[in-house]
């Protein structure tokens, strides 16, 4: 069975750094392109970035371009989300994902919650 | 980006009757595979989202027929045939042909009492 | 449009080196995917040999890890083979071939351009 | 490793009809619900050229006249109608745990 576990979520001041990590387990990591996709409280559904499945390619929303970097290490099947100079706007719940966008399932983890705050 | 910009923004249903959002993107889905990559997703209350269509018009497996997708180009509809209670939820596109992906701000569905 | 095609001599002798040359046109091999090596024996048996990815990282077939290195040369796009200490059975036709991903960051592990091959024979 | 064994190792199939084309892995292909399983097509002093991937997909290119299903340790190719230029041999390859391997090929003959 396909599992995506987040963890890495809290409180942090703006400014300041902080490294989500998602676990999967179930499926042939290494074989497939995983997402991050955020979610502000209360709001809708913002795609952050993805990762190719042998972390050659990597692309961005324009809103976390040049601060946040998406990596992978496929020997560990975990996904990372290392998010730096934090805004009180990137307040969100954060999921990573897999086959956003093609395939006849998709699979998402249950999210970890980023509050930024002074 | 792509803009995507869904219609209505909230939408009342009396269960069992059909219900209908629409979703047009700023430029066109058609993507250099040959396919139009428009995504809908459901999202129920305190829930992850889940994937309910993809490439316009495929259902996921395991998703009930009452749910179609449609649409071409720019333009794209989710249609509910009959309405049941565990459909509440937001409602969401995504266009999965340009980067940066991008969601239209969603649909809030709900049953009229 | 993506090229392969595998050079190197066509006769070896037994217990030295094999060495194998592919020259990629059409895309970079430091961009992306998995750089292959496979052979087709007489009888037209397949064997994968072995891959280096994008970064320089490889994955061989445990059968051949002793005797087997996948090599690069980023600044003319090519990538190489070294079989040590072959016999008549390494007789066979070289394959190079790359991965096939879609446009999503998925592979499949499947493979979807191959060089012509080239013709190898082991024998003294 | 995994051992893949088609068949038939040979079989001849007239012009419009449909060929069938069996590999059974000694291990499972799948994993997470998706199959690894490729089909590859080749033609005398040619490479092999792929056909069909995760098990049913077919690779850009291939005519609509081949399928691929199958899941776990069955998967199966199917031609039909088989055309003159079909004629080839024809591989399965698995690429769920390494090494990949290659099923030992059949050969298509149109009759």
């Known amino acids: 069975q396909v599992h995506l576990v987040e963890s890495g979520g809290g409180v942090v001041q703006p400014g300041r750094s902080l490294r989500l990590s998602c676990a999967a387990s179930g499926f042939k990591f290494r074989s497939y392109g995983m997402h991050w996709v955020r979610q502000a409280p209360g709001k809708g559904l913002e795609w952050v970035a993805i990762i190719w499945y042998d972390g050659s390619k990597r692309y961005y929303a324009d809103s976390v371009k040049g601060r946040f970097t998406i990596s992978r290490d496929n020997s560990k099947n975990t996904l990372y989300l290392q998010m730096s100079s934090l805004r009180a706007e990137d307040t969100a719940v954060y999921y990573c994902a897999r086959d956003l966008i093609t395939g006849t399932t998709d699979y998402w983890g249950q999210g970890t919650l980023v509050t930024v705050s002074s | 980006d792509v803009v995507m910009t869904q219609s209505p923004l909230s939408l009342p249903v009396t269960l069992g009757q059909p219900a209908s959002i629409s979703c047009r993107s700023s430029r066109s889905l058609v993507y250099s595979d040959g396919n139009t990559h428009l995504i809908w997703f459901q999202q129920r209350p305190g829930q992850s989202p889940r994937r309910l269509i993809y490439r316009v018009s495929n259902r996921v497996s395991g998703v009930p027929d009452r749910f179609s997708g449609s649409g071409s180009g720019t333009d794209f509809t989710l249609k509910i045939s009959r309405v049941e209670a565990e459909d509440v939820g937001v409602y969401y596109c995504l266009q999965g042909a340009h980067w940066p992906y991008t969601f239209g701000q969603g649909t809030k569905l709900e049953i009229k009492r | 449009d993506v090229q392969l095609q595998e050079s190197g001599p066509g006769l070896v002798k037994p217990s030295q080196s094999l060495s194998l040359t592919c020259s990629v046109t059409?895309?970079?091999?430091?961009?992306?995917?998995?750089w292959n090596w496979i052979r087709q024996f007489p009888g037209n048996k397949l064997e994968w040999m072995g891959y280096?990815?994008?970064?320089?990282?490889?994955n061989y077939n445990p059968s051949l890890k002793n005797r087997i290195s996948i090599t690069r040369d980023t600044s003319k796009n090519q990538f190489f083979l070294k079989l040590n200490s072959v016999t008549t059975e390494d007789t066979a036709t070289y394959y190079c071939?790359?991965?096939?991903?879609?446009?999503?960051?998925?592979?499949?592990?499947?493979?979807?351009?191959w060089g012509q091959g080239t013709s190898v024979t082991v024998s003294s | 490793d995994i051992l893949l064994t088609q068949s038939p190792g040979s079989l001849a199939v007239s012009l419009g009809q449909r060929a069938t084309i069996s590999c059974k892995a000694s291990?499972?292909?799948?994993?997470?619900?998706?199959?690894?399983m490729s089909w590859y097509q080749q033609k005398p002093g040619q490479p092999p050229k792929l056909l069909i991937y995760?098990?049913?997909n077919l690779e850009s290119g291939t005519p609509a006249r081949f399928s691929g299903s199958g899941s776990g340790t069955d998967f199966t190719l199917n031609i039909h109608p088989v055309e003159e230029e079909d004629a080839a041999t024809y591989y399965c390859q698995q690429g769920n745990e390494d090494p990949w391997t290659f099923g030992g090929g059949t050969k298509l003959e149109i009759k």
């Open positions: 071939a790359r991965n096939m991903a879609d446009y999503f960051g998925n592979t499949y592990d499947a493979l979807d351009y």
């Open positions: 995760a098990a049913s």
């Open positions: 291990q499972s292909a799948d994993y997470g619900g998706d199959s690894y």
């Open positions: 280096i990815m994008y970064d320089g990282n490889n």
């Open positions: 059409g895309y970079s091999i430091t961009s992306s995917y998995y």
